[in-house]
Amino acid sequence: AVNGTSQFTCFYNSRANISCVWSQDGALQDTSCQVHAWPDRRRWNQTCELLPVSQASWACNLILGAPDSQKLTTVDIVTLRVLCREGVRWRVMAIQDFKPFENLRLMAPISLQVVHVETHRCNISWEISQASHYFERHLEFEARTLSPGHTWEEAPLLTLKQKQEWICLETLTPDTQYEFQVRVKPLQGEFTTWSPWSQPLAFRTKPAALGKDT
C-alpha cells in the first residue's frame, strides 16, 4: 500500500510490556507480520507475531520479562520494526525509534473494592498494576460512576490530579445500584495516554432509614 495509509502505534506499560498495533489500508487479512524490538543499550531483543484484530489491523505484545521487572529506563531507545512475509522473504514495512517513557500506557487499575458505603456516599479504593517505581507520585487518575438509566459515555469524569488510590463518592441516591471505573496516566511522556478503564466495580448504596428525613 504505497499510497495507502498505515499506522504503527506502540505503548510501554512502564515495566516489561510493549503493546503494538499495526494497521494498513488494503492489506490482506492473512498477511503474516511480526514486530521486532532492538534496544540500543540492552543485550536482549524481542519479537512478537502480529495477530488480526480487525479488517486491516493487527496487534501484539512484546513481553520483555517478568511482569514487575523494570526492563527499560528513561534513557533507553528501542528500534521497533514491522516485518511482513512476502513470498520467501521478510520485508520491513515500518520502523520507529521508540522512546518508552515518552509513549506510556499503564495497565488498568486493579483490586477495586468498596471500603465503606452509606446511603449517600461510598468510599472506594484500588491499586495500580505493574507501574514503574520511577513515577514516584507523578500519576493522575480519572474516575466515573455509572448511574441507573445512563451510559458510561454520559458519566461525568472525576479527575484526581495526584497519586490518590481512593475516592469518596458523594451525593448518591439511597438504595441504588451503581458501577464505578477508574483509569491512570503518568504525567511523563509526550505521547503518553490513559490506561484502559478498570473492570467496573458494582455497589449499592444503603437504603434510607425508615421514618428518617433523607
Epitope: 504505497v2 495509509t5 504503527f8 531507545i77 525509534d97
Partner: nanobody, 123 residues
Amino acid sequence: QVQLVESGGGLVQAGGSLRLSCAAAGRAIENYPVGWFRRAPGKEREFVAAITWISGSTLYADSVKGRFTISRDNAKNTVYLQMSSLKPEDTALYYCAAALKTITRGQNDYSYWGQGTQVTVSS
C-alpha cells in the same frame, strides 16, 4: 510544526552522482523521521528512501537499493540522499517529507512536505 527545505538538485549525465539535502527545523525534530519521495513527469509520487533520526534505521525502494544512500547529520538537523549510477528514469522532482514517529513507504504516512528540488538525468 516541522519545516523542510530541499537543495542539491540539478542536471547530471547518466552514470553520474548528486547529493540532495533536506534541512529540517521544528520542535523535537528527532520525533519526526524523514523520507525522500519523487514525482516523475506524468507519474504518481513514489517512495525513494527514509531514515530515523536516532538509530539511523533506513528503508529503500527496490528501484534505488544499492545506488542511493540516505543518511543524516543530527548536529545539522539535515538528511542527505546520495544518488549514484543515476539513470534517465531517475529524472523527477524530489521531495523530502517528515513522518510522525514512524517511517514507511506510504506517502500518506508523512505529514510535512518540502517544496521539492528538481533532478534531471540526461542520456
